[in-house]
């Protein structure tokens, strides 16, 4: 019968010929009367056999990630008779893994959007690296993730690649962050290989800013001949939020005389001061009104940012018109 052990050859061996093992018949008494032959894919080109002894050699550098096993056939012939001593047999040469592949992030580029002011622990995104080395061979493909850039705002779970928020962020201070994640094989031990990826994390806006008047005091004038409904001027607040969160409504907070109104131009986000009642210079020629501004949409959980509406004072001077 045939006698052999399981055959392994390490990948990436640089030697010109590497002894893998011996293949022999138990009828071989060592007098060189038998001839061993190797057949199949790789025979002669990748592997050779010593015809007399049955010793098998790898004569080419192998890459396990390209091909991890070779199935070959062996024959043994009696030189004197030319007959097979043993029936032809199939055997396997396995290419054993070395840590020659760094982890790679295949789903690049990574981009995530997370609301500003999200609490610590909020999941942002999961990044996953893959390692072409053999996961069943030691730690060659066992990865650990770490954060190279992004502290103190982000953290990464070492074994899963899940990125979480570790510190609240304010979009109005910075609206996007580049996080760099490293994946290291060999669970970070010496000889480990690594790969990195960048994650662009954008902060979406939440309504955490109330509108504030640009001026604490405005001065407007109105002619006593102005009809009701006349626009006598504009006031403006600014809101550091964006989009819907920056939409605002202006209103009168104080006007004892009930002479003026304020409407909101939702396109320009300006407040337009309107004459509600005709004025009479001889009766009153100086008015003071207080206006306030509030956001249009404020979710209940964000009301804490909107406790006191911004106000401004508007001095309105009536201009005299000579009466006939």
């Amino acid at each position: 019968g045939w006698v052999w052990n399981q055959f392994f050859v390490p990948e990436e061996m640089n030697t010109t010929s590497h002894h893998i093992g011996q293949l022999r018949s138990d009828l071989d008494n060592g007098n060189n009367s038998f001839q061993y032959k190797l057949l199949g894919a790789g025979a002669g080109s990748t592997f050779i056999i010593d015809e007399r002894t049955g010793d098998i050699y790898a004569i080419q550098k192998l890459d396990r990630e390209e091909r991890s096993l070779y199935i070959l056939r062996a024959q043994v012939i009696d030189i004197a008779t030319g007959r097979a001593v043993e029936p032809e047999s199939e055997f396997v040469i396995k290419v054993s893994d070395i840590n020659d592949n760094e982890p790679k992030f295949l789903d690049e580029p990574y981009e995530a959007i997370v609301p500003e002011m999200s609490p610590e622990g909020t999941l942002v995104i999961q990044v996953t690296a893959s390692d072409a080395d053999d996961p069943s061979s030691g730690n060659n493909a066992r990865l650990l993730y770490s954060l190279l850039q992004g502290q103190p705002y982000f953290s990464v779970e070492p074994t899963t690649g899940v990125i979480r928020i570790s510190s609240k962020m304010d979009r109005e201070l910075q609206d996007e962050y580049w996080v760099i994640i490293q994946a290291k094989d060999m669970i970070g031990q010496p000889g480990a290989l690594s790969g990195t990826t960048s994650v662009l994390i954008k902060l979406s806006d939440v309504n955490d800013n109330k509108p504030i008047f640009k001026e604490s005091l405005y001065r407007l004038t109105v002619s006593e001949s102005a009809p009701t409904g006349t626009s006598i001027g504009t006031i403006m607040a600014y809101d550091n939020d964006i989009g819907e969160n920056a939409e605002m409504d202006y209103s009168i907070e104080e006007d004892d005389s009930q002479t003026f109104d304020i409407i909101t131009n939702h396109e320009t986000q300006e407040g337009i001061v309107i004459l509600k009642k005709k004025v009479d210079f001889e009766h009153q020629n100086h008015y003071g009104i207080r206006a306030k501004v509030k956001n249009h949409h404020v979710p209940e959980q964000l009301m804490k940012y909107h406790t006191e509406a911004s106000t401004t004072f508007i001095k309105i001077q009536v201009e005299d018109v000579d009466e006939p």
Epitope: E254, H286, G288, F313, K315
Partner: antibody
Framework: QVQLQESGPGLVKPSQTLSLTCTVS??????????WSWIRQHPGKGLEWIGY???????YYNPSLKSRVTISVDTSKNQFSLKLSSVTAADTAVYYC????????????WGQGTLVTVSS | EIVLTQSPGTLSLSPGERATLSCRAS???????LAWYQQKPGQAPRLLIY???SRATGIPDRFSGSGSGTDFTLTISRLEPEDFAVYYC????????FGQGTKVDIK
């Protein structure tokens, strides 16, 4: 803190023009929404508002003095001025410059006042 | 023009007493357009109250203002020695006019 300081001659002859200047410090005369006034007080009497000016040059005067009063502004010097023409002894008074308030037309800041006597 | 009449002309009180000063307008004015000032000899008037019950910066809370329509009041709840002075009301709705003043002196 806004401070105002009146300056000008303490003695003016009848029929001449009284000229006073108010220098503003601790704030800009061009601040939006503020009006700069002149007010006077006859000896031992009450207060009389003369007129005001806005930094743009828009002025408004007490109707009883309107024909004789001119108030002007010089934003580069942070000053505003009063001219009162054709003075008589009845114009003898302490003249104050003042700035109105941030929540109304009341007078929040005042100069210390300067006495102008009209006499030949 | 709106004429403001203050009464009494002189109020003689002792320190610690309550002072009530009146200001009456010749026609109705909004309470938002009335102010009170204090003036001591040789000094400029000092804003006390505006609108008509808001205290100006640095004014102690013993000073308070009230009123509406044509009748307005300045109250000094407990007179301090430094409160003896002349007090003026002023309206700033129709041009600007002052009352003739009330003198608060030591009895």
């Amino acid at each position: 803190q806004v401070q105002l300081q009146e300056s000008g001659p303490g003695l003016v002859k009848p029929s001449q023009t009284l000229s006073l200047t108010c220098t503003v410090s601790g704030g800009s005369i061009s601040s939006s929404g503020y009006y700069w006034s002149w007010i006077r007080q006859h000896p031992g009497k009450g207060l009389e508002w003369i007129g005001y000016i806005y930094y743009t040059g828009s002025a408004y005067y007490n109707p009883s003095l309107k024909s004789r009063v001119t108030i002007s502004v010089d934003t580069s010097k942070n000053q505003f001025s009063l001219k009162l023409s054709s003075v008589t002894a009845a114009d003898t008074a302490v003249y104050y410059c003042a700035r109105d308030g941030s929540s109304g037309w009341y007078f929040q800041y005042w100069g210390q006042g300067t006495l102008v006597t009209v006499s030949s | 023009e709106i004429v403001l009449t203050q009464s009494p002309g002189t109020l003689s009180l002792s320190p610690g007493e309550r002072a009530t000063l009146s200001c009456r307008a010749s026609r109705q004015i909004s309470s938002s357009y009335l102010a009170w000032y204090q003036q001591k000899p040789g000094q400029a008037p000092r804003l006390l109250i505006y609108g008509p019950s808001s205290r100006a910066t640095g004014i102690p809370d013993r000073f308070s203002g009230s009123g509406s329509g044509t009748d307005f009041t300045l109250t000094i709840s407990r007179l301090e020695p430094e409160d003896f002075a002349v007090y003026y009301c002023q309206q700033y709705g129709s041009s600007f006019t002052f009352g003739q003043g009330t003198k608060v002196d030591i009895k």
